[in-house]
């Protein structure tokens, strides 16, 4: 132990400690609860949740989606490929979660919690992943210009973008949860 430091071990009692899989599962469910809270405000504030004009806004977005080739579905399931996809997807969602930070009035704290808990989930998954080389981190410059572009949209498009981000993130996490339960 370095000087000026004092390391104190916490010993495990008789109960079973949380496993990596259990804790990741709980973390995803934590984020999903956060998304539900945010969606509640979004849907109460505007009629975006019932809107049929989603395609207009979706053209501006390149939100991560699970595809057959990612190996996360029951048919053609591949643990390594899927884990890489989940981590890569979460890293890609980070810029959109940053965009959400100024989009909520009464749920500002919840929006921050969703953003931070996603960062924590990435940490947990990166420890679980063996093939870290295959994980590409989004380019900060590209993210910065995307953020500027999203923030420059008119009010209706910003509301629609918020709705689409939350919906897509929820779907991505639900797919991830199902896949991780097979690992």
């Amino acid at each position: 132990v370095p000087p000026g430091e004092d390391s104190k071990d916490v010993a495990a009692p008789h109960r079973q400690p949380l496993t990596s899989s259990e804790r990741i599962d709980k973390q995803i469910r934590y984020i999903l609860d956060g998304i539900s809270a945010l969606r509640k405000e979004t849907c109460n504030k505007s009629n975006m949740c019932e809107s049929s004009k989603e395609a207009l806004a979706e053209n501006n977005l390149n939100l991560p989606k699970m595809a057959e080739k990612d190996g996360c579905f029951q048919s053609g399931f591949n643990e390594e490929t899927c884990l890489v996809k989940i981590i890569t997807g979460l890293l890609e969602f980070e810029v959109y979660l940053e965009y959400l930070q100024n989009r909520f009035e009464s749920s500002e704290e919840q929006a921050r919690a969703v953003q931070m808990s996603t960062k924590v989930l990435i940490q947990f998954l990166q420890k679980k992943a063996k093939n870290l080389d295959a994980i590409t981190t989004p380019d900060p410059t590209t993210n910065a210009s995307l953020l500027t572009k999203l923030q420059a949209q008119n009010q209706w498009l910003q509301d629609m973008t918020t709705h689409l981000i939350l919906r897509s993130f929820k779907e991505f996490l639900q797919s991830s949860l199902r896949a991780l339960r097979q690992m």
Partner: nanobody
Amino acid sequence: GGGLVQPGGSLRLSCAASGFTLDYYAVGWFRQAPGKEREGISCISSSDLKTYYADSVKGRFTISRDYAKSTVSLQMNSLKPEDTGVYYCAAGTWDLKFGYNISACVGSYEYDYWGQGTQVTVSS
């Protein structure tokens, strides 16, 4: 463990776990001064990294996580004689429900695991 520090000095306490991963748990730091009740001074959640500090240590103490080492540290600066006591770290899962109250982390929340404590003495 712990140590003798002069007033105004600094000390860093580090909490590690044996038999489980501390990364997955909310961690609180508590202290017990001679003849006094144990008091919660700081905590950090595992779910969204929210932190809390008791008024007595706010601005002087900093709690942080290190995922590489799976530890939680308490950096204590500008130490005062009244900071003297036995310091304990504890780990729990009270932060796993969205909307938990961070300020309750040093009081009403349950902790599953407790460290054995280390003596910190601030004196000239």
